[in-house]
Interface confidence: low
């Protein structure tokens, strides 16, 4: 077809283009005729007629005003019509540089996305570590200090800050204890930390009937079922995330107990260490 690009007429020997023979010119859509030495300048560029190839036949260069020659004095004002197939339009090194640059940019972008893409922070409630009990016989009140254990796993390739842990303990749908820990720790890339937190709880007032259950030795097992709720707030890149866990646990309200941490995801009957 007629798809041709416009370039300044004078040739450039860079980019591996070294001048053309008449055969080369034929290939490049340029036809040379005999040189005319009107002004004695051998090879004057104005002596070349310019012809456009359409594929089947040729058309005289429209900028030559039908003469087949470039008018004197206009050598630097006119343009040549050069086909897209001209090698000067395909400088190999520049193409390589552009491709390499694009590849490097894509690679760096991919790596940045891979390493900086936010991954999940995993919070696993391990269980009750210990429960220390005391009683107020007059008030028929039980005080339980329950220490729980959490595993927090950072799946990111950058550090994550554990801003705070809020916890509460429920007995029979009533909140009997709350705790909040602030500015806890940083967790390194792909690291895991075990965190213990203690929730002081009070079983009193409308639940004072539990005083008998927990203190009477005529009751063989003093296990009570408590619901442990914990929310961990983490921060990275100025973004905060909250992860919550809930678990029912048996706790012995009859004596001070240290538990073997159970890994099961389900309700655990925790037996004291012997």
């Amino acid at each position: 077809g007629k798809s041709l690009s416009h370039l300044p007429l004078h040739s450039n020997k860079e980019d591996g283009y070294d001048g053309v023979t008449s055969t080369d010119n034929m290939r490049n859509g340029l036809v040379s005729s005999e040189v005319h030495n009107e002004d004695g300048r051998n090879g004057d560029v104005s002596q070349f007629p310019y012809v456009e190839f359409t594929g089947r036949d040729s058309v005289t260069c429209p900028t030559c005003q039908g003469t087949g020659r470039i008018p004197r004095g206009q050598e630097n004002q006119l343009v040549a019509l050069i086909p897209y197939s001209d090698q000067r339009l395909r400088p190999r090194r520049t193409k390589l540089y552009v491709m390499a640059s694009v590849f490097v940019c894509l690679l760096l972008s991919g790596l940045a996305v891979f390493f900086l893409f936010p991954r999940s922070i995993e919070v696993k409630y391990i269980g009750v570590k210990s429960a220390y009990v005391s009683y107020d016989a007059e008030k028929r009140t039980i005080y339980l200090n329950i220490t729980n254990t959490l595993n927090i796993t950072n799946n990111n390739y950058y550090s994550v800050e554990v801003e705070n842990i809020t916890a509460q303990v429920q007995f029979s749908k009533t909140v009997i204890g709350k705790a909040r820990l602030n500015n806890i720790t940083n967790i390194g890339p792909l690291d895991m930390k075990q965190i213990d937190y203690t929730v002081p709880t009070v079983i009193a007032e409308e639940m004072s009937y539990m005083y008998d259950f927990c203190t009477l030795l005529s009751i063989k097992v003093h296990n009570i079922v408590l619901m442990m709720q914990v929310t961990v707030t983490t921060a990275y890149f100025g973004h905060s995330e909250q992860i919550s866990q809930e678990r029912y646990q048996y706790v012995d309200c009859g004596r001070n107990t240290t538990y073997q941490l159970a890994q099961s995801e389900y309700l655990n009957v925790l037996q004291p260490q012997q």
Partner: antibody, heavy 118, light 113 residues
Framework: EVQLQQSGPVLVKPGPPVKISCKAS????????IHWVKLSHGKSLEWIGL????????DYNQKFKGKATLTVDTSSSTAYMELNSLTSEDSAVYYC???????????WGQGTTVTVSS | DIVMTQSPSSLSVSAGEKVTMSCKSS????????????LAWYQQKPGQPPKLLIY???TRESGVPDRFTGSGSGTDFTLTISNVQAEDLAVYYC?????????FGAGTKLELK
């Protein structure tokens, strides 16, 4: 080695009380319940009650309330049982035994024979 | 109180035989909280204190030969002694370990034929 060393046999007249002891060794006394069990001739074992040395709490079989009094001395790791208003029905071998938490008594004393005779 | 009923009251066996004794409780000894049966078996030889053989209905106490096996759940329990030895001749008691007062069966006396 876990041991529960009981006091020797006693022969008493009906009426006045008698106190028998059970000295513990080889384990942390305050971590265990101390039980007392009666074995009468020709009868089965009967649970009298228990004491928790950690805080001195006691619990009795209703049948033995008023008959037996259980105490401990943690400084000497010794448990005591006092039997009062003795009659011939109280003649038996009395054992102390220990349990941890909600487990079955695993170690027993060698027994103290109490004979009530006029 | 939980009543423990043992049967038979006595058993005559020859050495090497397998024996089974039964224990029934008036209430379930299964703790619904931890699905554990609170029943123990004791062996008592003349002039000696009772010796714990089995707890939790089926768990053998350390040092107890594996010819002693406990089984059962709820209210019906069994103690099996395979390959009876002369030293096994004794009175065997089952015990409610579920709730106070602790109660014992009347015992099964194992005798030689």
């Amino acid at each position: 080695e876990v041991q529960l060393q009981q006091s020797g046999p006693v022969l008493v007249k009906p009426g006045p009380p008698v106190k028998i002891s059970c000295k513990a060794s080889g384990f942390t006394f305050t971590d265990y319940y101390i039980h007392w069990v009666k074995l009468s001739h020709g009868k089965s074992l009967e649970w009298i009650g228990l004491v928790y040395p950690y805080n001195g709490d006691t619990d009795y079989n209703q049948k033995f309330k008023g008959k037996a009094t259980l105490t401990v001395d943690t400084s000497s790791s010794t448990a005591y049982m006092e039997l009062n208003s003795l009659t011939s029905e109280d003649s038996a071998v009395y054992y102390c035994a220990r349990t941890y938490y909600a487990n079955s008594p695993d170690y027993w004393g060698q027994g103290t024979t109490v004979t009530v005779s006029s | 109180d939980i009543v423990m009923t043992q049967s038979p009251s006595s058993l005559s066996v020859s050495a090497g035989e397998k024996v089974t004794m039964s224990c029934k409780s008036s209430q379930s000894l299964l703790n619904s909280g931890n699905q554990r049966n609170y029943l123990a078996w004791y062996q008592q030889k003349p002039g000696q204190p009772p010796k714990l053989l089995i707890y939790g209905a089926s768990t053998r106490e350390s040092g107890v030969p594996d010819r002693f096996t406990g089984s059962g759940s709820g209210t019906d329990f069994t103690l099996t002694i395979s390959n009876v030895q002369a030293e096994d001749l004794a009175v065997y008691y089952c015990q409610n370990d579920h709730s106070y007062p602790l109660t014992f069966g009347a015992g099964t006396k194992l005798e030689l034929k």
